[in-house]
Interface confidence: medium
């Protein structure tokens, strides 16, 4: 079974504790299929692995709205 | 220990320059993000710029944004805010911070600060 | 970015509880961090992400954060706690927004 820290990632069975730095994360999908034990957001890191992490906590909230603002307003 | 020692502080005339700089040791440098924050007299404290641990991006204050620039040396473990086009009001005491993760940025380590003084 | 409001002052009798107060909107969505400063000296970290403390900070240090209002509270509070406290938050694109700080005075 995938873990909080598994790729590739259907389903997420856990979440990762631990904040990631955005700077480690190039994009995220939402996981809201009635399938899946429960809802969640999978964040793709700079180097290809995929985190599960749970919607709910600030930090998931933040990092999505920071790769969101990210894709709007590329580095000059 | 984590040590951050800033320098580079002192007087100079409004309209002037200035380049602050701090010197890192006791942790992996190129790990964290490092900022700026600056205190002046007698008030709060104020935000004043960022800088990712790879120095891919950088964020600034309104108050400084266009005068200020800040950077880093990984491979001297060295910090710097380059100063131009200074106001009285950019008068503080400027400290060096490091933190972890963005972009909850909060600050677990300070430096003991560098004095600029604007004026004529 | 967010503006937060504290206090500008707070006094509590020598071990009570004291409680400081962040206000901003929507503040309870955001972390909240929480600085101990005393004259002369740096700005030190007692409360990271709401409510945890760093290692070395006392116990009696506490945080909680929901609604509009963060509150920093030192239960118990000794004199060698008299000093600035200073909350603070962030914006998703890496800005840092401070407030005006609360003198905590130990009567």
């Known amino acids: 079974q995938p873990d909080a820290i598994n790729a590739p990632v259907t389903c997420c069975y856990n979440f990762t504790n631990r904040k990631i730095s955005v700077q480690r994360l190039a994009s995220y999908r939402r996981i809201t299929s009635s399938k899946c034990p429960k809802e969640a957001v999978i964040f793709k890191t700079i180097v290809a692995k995929e985190i599960c992490a749970d919607p709910k906590q600030k930090w998931v909230q933040d990092s999505m709205d920071h790769l969101d603002k990210q894709i709007q307003t590329p580095k000059p | 220990q984590v040590q951050l020692v800033e320098s580079g502080g002192g007087l100079v005339q409004p309209g002037g320059s200035l380049r602050l700089s701090c010197a890192a040791s006791g942790f992996t440098f190129r790990s964290y993000g490092m900022s700026w924050v600056r205190q002046a007299p007698g008030k709060g404290l104020e935000w004043v710029s960022n800088?990712?641990?790879?120095?891919?991006?950088?964020y600034y204050a309104d108050s400084v944004k266009g005068r200020f620039t800040i950077s880093r040396d990984n491979s001297k473990n060295t910090l710097y805010l380059q100063m131009n086009s200074l106001r009285a009001e950019d008068t503080a005491v400027y400290y060096c911070?490091?933190?972890?993760?963005?972009?909850?940025?909060?600050?677990?380590?300070w430096g003991q600060g560098t004095l600029v003084t604007v004026s004529s | 970015d967010i503006e937060l409001t504290q206090p500008p002052s707070v006094s509590v009798a020598p071990g009570q509880t004291a409680r400081i107060s962040c206000s901003g909107d929507n503040l309870g969505k955001k972390y909240v961090y929480w600085y101990q400063q005393k004259p002369g000296q740096a700005p030190v970290l007692v409360i990271y992400?709401?409510?945890n403390r760093p290692s070395g900070i006392p116990e009696r240090f506490s945080g909680s954060n929901s609604g509009n209002t963060a509150t920093l509270t030192i239960s118990g509070t000794q004199a060698e706690d008299e000093a600035d406290y200073y909350c603070q938050s962030y914006t998703a694109q890496s800005s840092a927004s401070f407030g005006g700080g609360t003198k905590l005075t130990v009567l």
């Open positions: 992400d709401d409510d």
């Open positions: 800088i990712r641990s790879d120095g891919s991006y950088t």
């Open positions: 911070a490091r933190f972890e993760f963005t972009p909850w940025t909060y600050f677990d380590f």
